[in-house]
Amino acid sequence: TTTEVVMENVTAFWEEGFGELFEKAKQNNNNRKTSNGDDSLFFSNFSLLGTPVLKDINFKIERGQLLAVAGSTGAGKTSLLMVIMGELEPSEGKIKHSGRISFCSQFSWIMPGTIKENIIFGVSYDEYRYRSVIKACQLEEDISKFAEKDNIVLGEGGITLSGGQRARISLARAVYKDADLYLLDSPFGYLDVLTEKEIFESCVCKLMANKTRILVTSKMEHLKKADKILILHEGSSYFYGTFSELQNLQPDFSSKLMG
């Protein structure tokens, strides 16, 4: 099953432990379960102490939908994901969802071990699922170049990967995990545009089509394909709706949101 996500009037503040929280979130494989029992994620009136990183955020994603989250640097995009993961506690509001979360950080990481071990990452092995993920994340060609194929060792004492390869393996790890909600935090930052387009289509739009997905992105092409769009500005929700609704805000949209 996939999850529905709801956030209502959520406000959140970073406290002094921001650094530790962030590091923890980067490494977190998000096996936590919530027991709402209604297969949904809900975000309502959420805030943190001090200067709020999120202020009165509201949205609802139906199960199987893609929510694109955009905004300038520091707008609160990653903080929003932290709140959903439970790494950042809201001072106000409600978040509702159920099921497992898989998180792909904008900072890709590789552990010492084989490519396969890096993708499976402790989850039970399913050949068909694994092959589907490898293909969707454009890793087949990379793997085929190694004599050891996906048993090539990475990390300490192993081969060095390019930034793009690291990014694709990190994404594959997140996608391989059988979760109810997938949080993808700018996963294409280290990919060339051709690879990014292919992976967005084959992985995010096709392979994960029936999964609930939240994608942090700045690309208009991604916003066009999303079921819903949330644009954050200085921690607040400037816009929430569909791409066609966003277009209807022009030119007001442009004049107000520049800067």
Partner: nanobody, 123 residues
Amino acid sequence: QVQLQESGGGLVQAGGSLRLACAATGSIRNINTMGWYRQAPGKQRDMVAFITRAGNTDYADSVKGRFTISRDNARNTVYLRMNSLKPEDTATYYCHAEIAERSRPFYLTDDYWGQGTQVTVSS
């Protein structure tokens, strides 16, 4: 509104060098990734090299150690230094940039491509 203009292509003998440049002009707020891609006749367009705003680079295996990508953020320009050129490097080279126009709020970006510059390496 926004344009990418490549320059520096031409005819060169195998083993020679070229330096391509691509300047983005127009109403530009911010440029994220910039890169070079090439397309030989009858083949698909492939990535050659790209560079993030922070300077992280990636290269196609076939050009590693021979080509170097760099960028000048102040001039909105990306360069490709091509050394030890081979006949198989012959192609039209296209510049790409992910750009946030000034009319786009919140640094929302679009993909832009140049018209291409021809590189021919003779044996």
